[in-house]
Interface confidence: low
């Protein structure tokens, strides 16, 4: 005897936006206001996230998806799904464990977030420093002395550094 029918969870037919209501003989009931279910077969709906205080609403909650928050001006998101807002710093600073601090000499940050990065070392490419770096800007590398013959190419700016950002996960 071959079993041709697998036992099916009676809740598996409930689509996203509903929940399997055990109080009503496992009928699929719509999620109540301010709640959602993003997948089918849910026993309950999840409470919608509320974007309050330093958080602001980027996307409203629907019956099938949670609200999405971002941060008010002066702050930026941290963590999966913007679970926290971290204060911005000024260009030329980085947020340390104890607050915004100026970049050390020899480093720069041209963003309001992220970490200070070392100035480009022009000499590694056989070039010279054309414009000195600051806390806010990288150095600009110029042609090497050998390149200063007639017909030499013009100034080469350093390749843009990747924004490291924060990675709490």
């Amino acid at each position: 005897f071959e079993r041709t029918r697998s036992l099916q969870d009676p809740c598996s037919n409930c689509p996203a936006g509903t929940f399997c209501d055990n109080n009503r003989n496992q009928i699929c009931s719509p999620c109540p206001p301010n709640s959602f279910s993003s997948a089918g077969g849910q026993r309950t709906c999840d409470i919608c996230r509320q974007c309050k205080g330093v958080f602001r609403t980027r996307k409203e909650c629907s019956s099938t998806s949670n609200a999405e928050c971002d941060c008010t001006p002066g702050f930026h998101c941290l963590g999966a799904g913007c679970s926290m807002c971290e204060q911005d710093c000024k260009q030329g600073q980085e947020l340390t464990k104890k607050g915004c601090k100026d970049c050390c000499f020899g480093t720069f940050n041209d963003q309001k977030r992220g970490i200070c990065r070392p100035w480009t070392n022009c000499s590694l490419d056989g070039k010279s420093v054309l414009v000195n770096g600051t806390k806010e800007r990288d150095v600009v590398c110029g042609p090497s002395p050998a390149d200063l013959s007639p017909g030499a190419s013009s100034v080469t700016p350093p390749a843009p550094a990747r924004e490291p950002g924060h990675s709490p996960q």
Partner: antibody, heavy 118, light 111 residues
Framework: EVQLVESGGGLVQPGGSLRLSCAAS????????ISWVRQAPGKGLEWVAI???????DYARSAKGRFTISRDNSKNTLYLQMNSLRAEDTAVYYC????????????WGQGTLVTVSS | DIQMTQSPSSLSASVGDRVTITCQSS????????LAWYQQKPGKVPKLLIY???TLASGVPSRFSGSGSGTDFTLTISSLQPEDVATYYC???????????FGGGTKVEIK
């Protein structure tokens, strides 16, 4: 699921040593600042030590010279080596993960009890 | 040593009351705002309520608010609820050569 689980607590005699572990899951320890915080029975919270994502460490005066915080990135585990233990070190020890500032301890383990007694 | 003085040490209030807890530090916290508030219910681990002195942590009810700067900080519960029965702690962060410090805690009960 993001969580921290402490272990290694127990009964130890004064002057003895103990190593607490804090296993992380759902995130990488080496990308986060992790603190140890303790709470003596019926008392308040006391900050003990921190290791930054850079590996920089910092200790409370009560822990300096006796406790060492470290981590093993391959095991995604944090440690607190406690030497020269005293009766006043008796407490539940929590590890906690922070963001940005040290004061923002967002995720806490369930704690492990250390009892120092003869 | 820096003292983080939290007051009162305990209080009893009615449901719906406005409750205020203060933390006073003998030295300014870093950046004047590196202070957080935690809630610890009996037998549970602490939970972050407020960070950067006044920023509400994710998922925390809006009846909780924080204010203050430098050395003086306040946690306010605008309308006390039965589920707010807990002990509340502040935690300040200081310059590199100074210990981070918790306040002594405030036990909140319902009348």
């Amino acid at each position: 699921e993001v969580q921290l689980v402490e272990s290694g607590g127990g009964l130890v005699q004064p002057g003895g040593s103990l190593r607490l572990s804090c296993a992380a899951s759902g995130f990488s320890l080496n990308n986060n600042a992790i603190s140890w915080v303790r709470q003596a029975p019926g008392k308040g919270l006391e900050w003990v030590a921190i290791i930054q994502n850079t590996g920089t460490t910092d200790y409370a005066r009560s822990a300096k010279g006796r406790f060492t915080i470290s981590r093993d990135n391959s095991k995604n585990t944090l440690y607190l080596q406690m030497n020269s233990l005293r009766a006043e070190d008796t407490a539940v020890y929590y590890c906690a993960r922070g963001y940005g500032f040290e004061s923002e301890l967002v995720i806490w383990g369930q704690g492990t009890l250390v009892t120092v007694s003869s | 040593d820096i003292q983080m003085t939290q007051s009162p040490s305990s209080l009893s209030a009615s449901v719906g009351d406005r409750v205020t807890i203060t933390c006073q530090s003998s030295q300014s916290v870093y950046n004047n705002n590196a202070l957080a508030w935690y809630q610890q219910k009996p037998g549970k681990v602490p939970k972050l309520l407020i960070y950067l002195a006044s920023t509400l942590a994710s998922g925390v009810p809006s009846r909780f608010s924080g204010s203050g700067s430098g050395t003086d900080f306040t946690l306010t519960i605008s309308s006390l609820q039965p589920e707010d029965v807990a002990t509340y702690y502040c935690l300040g962060v200081y310059n590199d050569d100074v210990d981070n410090g918790f306040g002594g805690g405030t036990k909140v009960e319902i009348k």
